[in-house]
């Protein structure tokens, strides 16, 4: 999906209002210095591309993020403010259904959410360079 035509201000507002709080709740008990951020993003479409991939693509070390509240809200926000996004997300929905139902928060999932927080913060800071 090409995130170029999203309403970035509305996504930013949704992030600040709800998604950020859910991410921070997920990370409760850990310090921001506990994990080293190894990925970043260049501009807002890039940030959303990586946020979407990291949130919804299960990895061997952390398969369950797509079931979390912040992921559900992220999906709803992107569907609301990115034209045509929801039509592209049928496969992602299947991935969510297949994700482990376990609510155990592993250290690797905490690390992945720490990376997500970094990408979201970069999204907020970054001026849109490509329209």
């Amino acid at each position: 999906y090409d995130f170029t035509n999203c309403d970035f201000q509305k996504i930013e507002a949704d992030y600040l209002r709800t998604i950020s709080k859910d991410l921070i709740t997920y990370m409760s008990g850990t310090k921001s210095t506990d994990f080293n951020n190894t990925v970043s993003c260049s501009n807002r479409p890039h940030c959303l591309t990586e946020i979407q991939s990291l949130t919804f693509n299960p990895t061997p070390r952390c398969a369950s993020l797509a079931k979390e509240m912040f992921a559900r809200k992220t999906k709803a926000t992107l569907a609301l403010w990115c034209p045509g996004y929801s039509e592209t997300q049928i496969n992602a929905t299947q991935a969510m259904k297949k994700a482990r139902k376990s609510k155990v928060t592993t250290n690797k999932c905490l690390e992945q959410v720490s990376q997500l927080l970094g990408l979201w913060r970069r999204f907020i800071r970054t001026l849109l360079k490509k329209q």
């Epitope: 990925v39 890039h46 693509n57 990895t59 001026l127 490509k130």
Partner: antibody, heavy 117, light 108 residues
């Protein structure tokens, strides 16, 4: 300390597919960062080809996107480049590098690929 | 596409002298700029990122400055091992990251 080493054929015929592999040691490619390919034609500057992130997202240079595929094999801790329909203009030293998806902090030594019949 | 232009193409200096290399972007890249050093037959090495932050293990004689479209890499006092080609790279314009054409710092 992370180390990267490129390997693959040094000679590829025009219209064929160039295939290179980057073996990574000292760091798991599924633990963090992105893993990128960059090339440098003889005597010229650098050109970013693309990356695959530790969680599997890919991004390619738009000028090469239709011909490029970057994939990974986490069991072997390596990632690969395929560049199809090559011409003499694809002759270059190809580098693999570790990236935070912005800039490149560790590089392989590079491998020269010549496109010629 | 953002075009990165480096000047001069070649800089002839003696060890101990100060080197000032310029990189200009065709449009603003904020501080999204890196500098690399490349010696003959070797891979590039990251020197500076975010326009002014030194990469791990890079000596303090290397410094970067600038924002927007004009950037400078300064080597305060050239050591023999500093004679090489230097490239700038913008990472503001994903997915069209681009490098400058390079500045060669040679021994006078």
């Amino acid at each position: 300390q992370v180390q990267l080493q490129e390997s693959g054929p040094g000679l590829v015929k025009p219209s064929e597919t160039l295939s290179l592999t980057c073996a990574v040691s000292g760091y798991s490619i599924s633990s963090g960062y992105g893993w990128s390919w960059i090339r440098q034609p003889p005597g010229k500057g650098l050109e970013w080809i693309g990356y695959i992130s530790y969680y599997g997202s890919t991004s390619y240079n738009p000028s090469l996107k239709s011909r490029v595929t970057i994939s990974r094999d986490t069991s072997k801790n390596q990632f690969s480049l395929k560049l199809s329909s090559v011409t003499a203009a694809d002759t270059a030293v190809y580098y693999c590098a570790r990236t935070n998806l912005l800039y490149f902090d560790s590089w392989g030594q590079g491998t020269l690929v010549t496109v010629s019949s | 596409e953002i075009v990165m232009t480096q000047s001069p193409a070649t800089l002839s200096l003696s060890p101990g002298e100060r080197a000032t290399l310029s990189c200009r972007a065709s449009q603003s890249v904020s501080n999204n700029l890196a500098w690399y050093q490349q010696k003959p037959g070797q891979a590039p090495r990251l020197l500076i990122y975010d326009a002014s932050s030194r990469a791990t293990g890079i000596p303090a004689r290397f410094s970067g400055s600038g924002s927007g479209t004009d950037f400078t890499l300064t080597i305060s006092s050239l050591e023999p091992e500093d004679f090489a080609v230097y490239y700038c790279q913008q990472y503001s314009d994903w997915p069209e990251y681009s490098f400058g054409q390079g500045t060669k710092v040679e021994i006078k």
